[in-house]
């Protein structure tokens, strides 16, 4: 056997070359042959009128020819034949690849709450051979669930993904991503997620700022609260009592001027939104004011005093439940 | 310009015979390949016999092998097919075909207009 050929993989649309090669040639005539076994060419003659066949080369040793605008149709097996004595017959198997037409991806719900379950689908449609889908929430890969349908040599891909929400993936970019012979570079679509969630409150003391609340002093808090959609009413309560009669609250913020001992107890924000309330609490303690130490005649001493205060923030963020968010001052 | 007619089909009945012949002119006849190529009602192109410049080495599809024979004579430009025992599958439109070039380097596929053959009982 001294007649060779190779096999051909194409991307539909573009050109395939087929090449029947004769090693050791004694002139002997090289004829091609379609899949149907319909003579392409012999020798430099091309009894098929299809225009998208045209001569390459031809020698003794070789015929060369190109197929051009390839399509699915044209798949299969293409015959080299030599007419020699005996007859001898290679055959180059053509390879047509199809990427897929277009990537669709399909969520379920356009707003997700936090904690909810969701279904993402991606569909790459008409490929072949079938496309490997991925996907991604960000730049962390996820687990897909692939359903492959066959049509007519053609595969349409669906794949699904199960994706349970937090707060943190809102505004976070799911990627499907498809894989595929007949596809170079990134081939990918992707949507934004939305997801609301309930109120994540703060109580920042803005006033004093040392921390340390004395008699006589002012104390100026303010509660941060962040939720999706934004909370609408921020609240100020004290628990377990009522509001000292000096006391001023203005949107966000609350004012106590003139501390005492009576005010000392637990102040409360509160915060909600459609998703669900929460709440931060701040436990004030007021201290005496700093005593005054006569001079002495003879001699000065000057004694400082450092206090530390710890402020330690328990938050339970359970949807639709109150938390219980405690500030404490040591 | 090149020019090839054929002539000699017609309608016979199975198992008889036809003699196609093609008349050509317009190129140095002598110095191509000759070839006959066929097309059935409904079908693609097929092709049928080769003969080399000389006709010393002539070539036939399957189909038509050991019934078929393909000729030549250069000193005439005519080339023909002779046809035995014919098939009801034989029923076409005959072709003859050459691939020459007239006063350039570029070679061309020539084919004639047809001739049609019907094998009918």
């Known amino acids: 056997q001294n007649l060779f050929t190779k096999d051909v993989t194409v991307i539909e649309g573009e050109v395939a070359t087929i090449s029947c090669q004769v090693n050791k040639s004694d002139d002997s005539v090289i004829q091609l042959l379609n899949p149907n076994r319909q003579t392409i060419y012999f020798r430099d003659f091309r009894p098929l009128k299809d225009s998208r066949f045209q001569l390459l080369n031809f020698s003794s040793s070789e015929l060369k020819v190109s197929l051009t605008n390839v399509s699915i149709s044209d798949e299969g097996r293409y015959f080299c034949q030599l007419y020699t004595d005996p007859p001898q017959e290679s055959y180059t198997t053509i390879t047509v690849l199809v990427p897929p037409r277009n990537l669709m991806i399909d969520i379920q719900k356009d707003t997700a709450v936090e904690g909810e379950e969701i279904e993402v689908n991606c569909t790459a449609m008409a490929s072949k051979p079938a496309t490997t889908i991925r996907w991604f929430k960000g730049n962390t890969e996820l687990k897909g669930k692939s359903e492959v349908e066959e049509w007519s040599d053609m595969y349409t891909v669906t794949s699904q993904l199960m994706l349970k929400v937090h707060k943190e993936d809102d505004g976070v970019p799911v990627i499907c991503q498809v894989e595929h012979p007949a596809v170079t570079g990134n081939l990918q679509t992707q949507r934004y997620l939305e997801v609301q969630y309930k109120p994540q409150v703060h109580i920042q003391m803005t006033y004093p700022l040392q921390g340390l609340t004395r008699e006589g002093d002012a104390l100026e808090l303010t509660c941060e609260a962040i939720g999706k959609p934004q909370p609408v009413m921020v609240t100020w309560v004290r628990v377990d009592d009522e509001m000292p009669q000096h006391a001023v609250l203005s949107g966000p913020n609350l004012f106590i001027n003139n501390l005492n001992k009576t005010d000392n107890g637990t102040y409360r924000c509160e915060a909600s939104n459609i998703v669900g309330k929460a709440h931060s609490d701040y436990m004030l303690y007021v201290y005496d004011p700093p005593t005054t130490i006569p001079p002495p005649t003879t001699t000065t001493t000057t004694t400082t005093t450092t206090t530390t205060t710890i402020l330690t923030i328990i938050t339970d963020s359970r949807a639709g439940e109150e938390g219980s968010i405690r500030a404490v001052d040591h | 310009q090149v020019q090839l007619v054929e002539s000699g089909g017609g309608l016979v009945q199975p198992g008889g015979s036809l003699r196609l012949s093609c008349a050509a002119s317009?190129?140095?006849?002598?110095?191509?390949?000759m070839y006959w190529v066929r097309q059935a009602p409904g079908k693609g192109l097929e092709w049928v016999s080769a003969i080399n410049t000389g006709g010393g080495s002539t070539y036939y599809a399957d189909s038509v092998k050991g019934r078929f024979t393909i000729s030549r004579d250069n000193a005439k430009n005519t080339l023909y097919l002779q046809m035995n025992s014919l098939k009801p599958e034989d029923t076409a439109l005959y072709y003859c075909?050459?691939?020459?070039?007239?006063?350039?380097?570029?070679?061309?596929?020539?084919w004639g207009q047809g001739t049609q053959v019907t094998v009918s009982s």
């Open positions: 075909a050459t691939r020459a070039s007239v006063g350039t380097l570029e070679m061309y596929d020539n």
């Open positions: 317009g190129f140095t006849f002598s110095s191509y390949w």
